[in-house]
Amino acid sequence: QDPYVKEAENLKKYFNAGHSDVADNGTLFLGILKNWKEESDRKIMQSQIVSFYFKLFKNFKDDQSIQKSVETIKEDMNVKFFNSNKKKRDDFEKLTNYSVTDLNVQRKAIHELIQVMAELSPAAKTGKRKRSQMLFRGRRASQ
Amino acid sequence: QDPYVKEAENLKKYFNAGHSDVADNGTLFLGILKNWKEESDRKIMQSQIVSFYFKLFKNFKDDQSIQKSVETIKEDMNVKFFNSNKKKRDDFEKLTNYSVTDLNVQRKAIHELIQVMAELSPAAKTGKRKRSQMLFRGRRASQ
């Protein structure tokens, strides 16, 4: 059994989240994850889910009674989701920490927007896929 | 030329983000995107980047002078990143809108944590990949 299981059960007690009524009105994450089989689609969703948990854990970082459980779960998330790759984890954390209300951050984000957009679709990576996609989709008026 | 280019240039003027000094102290997103070639890694990062832009655009939704530019860029993001898949976009939006301070959301998130964790690594999907990954990583103390 993975280490996180015991610690997650501990968190369930702490948050009073073991009761069946918690499942009322549908799920937060599980229903959404069921919709996506493609690895790249799953990563889009899991990226948001993982950042949610990290934010949640941050809010409880001073609570000693669940400190060990939180740390163990975060370690396991780092192994499972980031494949123990510290650079991947660091880059992810940088992105989640940018403040959308910081004027310098806003200016940089807008400055980079065209290049970010150009890289958004997988098609942007290879000319061949781009071309076939365009033939398939129909021509764009702007092209 | 894609429609977003002209509109992004318009936003650059509005945010005063065309000056060379904007690039001082490194990039927000471009440097990070350069680090990741694997499609699934890119999606992890792009998921955070796209949610940042959507948040940023939301903050300026009442500013009529950039309304058309923002709408056009969002349209193009929906095509490029979500492949015009409304369900993908809706699921993504649900995830970004969950409040980490809402007690019911916290309870649900902890309730679902074990199952979310079990699905985090691609390895969870196929036994073969799981085995090779374990050999690569070395044995975990718990195994």
């Epitope: 989709r137 | 894609d2 058309k68 709408e71 349209e75 409304k86 369900k87 976009r89």
Partner: antibody, heavy 122, light 110 residues
Amino acid sequence: EVQLLESGGGLVQPGGSLRLSCAASGFTFSSYAMSWVRQAPGKGLEWVSAISGSGGSTYYADSVKGRFTISRDNPKNTLYLQMNSLRAEDTAVYYCAKDLTVGGPWYYFDYWGQGTLVTVSS
Amino acid sequence: NFMLTQPHSVSESPGKTVTISCTRSSGSIVSNYVQWYQQRPGSAPTTVIFDDDQRPSGVPGRFSGSLDSSSNSASLTISGLQTEDEADYYCQSYDSSNVVFGGGTKVTVL
């Protein structure tokens, strides 16, 4: 109340041209992608073309690519379909349809016009 | 390209329930929304179900939509069938630049 009213249909010879219009009212036209969907006599529905709300991006079914051009005039709340090099198999009722949600095209429709009949025959 | 396959026709007596299936040939039915349109003879289509299972305002509660991932299909159920429900019904979905309609199902109220 959302209303879509197509016009411009009629009888045309093979190889000929026709321009369809769709006058829209009751919603913020420029916020929604729009599509043309056709239905051959006694047949099912076939998507033809779409255009983003801003008008900057257009999309076509393979069957009409290079022959049809979709466009819109947002100040006039009007959608167009320019049809060139028409063939017998283009004979159909042509509907304009509004996207369900802003930010598209999402290719799901909540309102349709009453349709205009295009007949291609010699 | 995927296809959406519907039964050609179904018929039932007033007050009864009919279910129309819409089976996706490839790709997952749950990874894209399914929409259902009603088309009465000589009229334009109208939406009866959007986003898999949502009803537009004005559409009676007798209409419901669902997905079944095990059969990779969507279903439209009309309960308490009425004479005005007699029409053609089309399912529709979208994936990777393909806008796909089912072939349509003619519902006859006996």
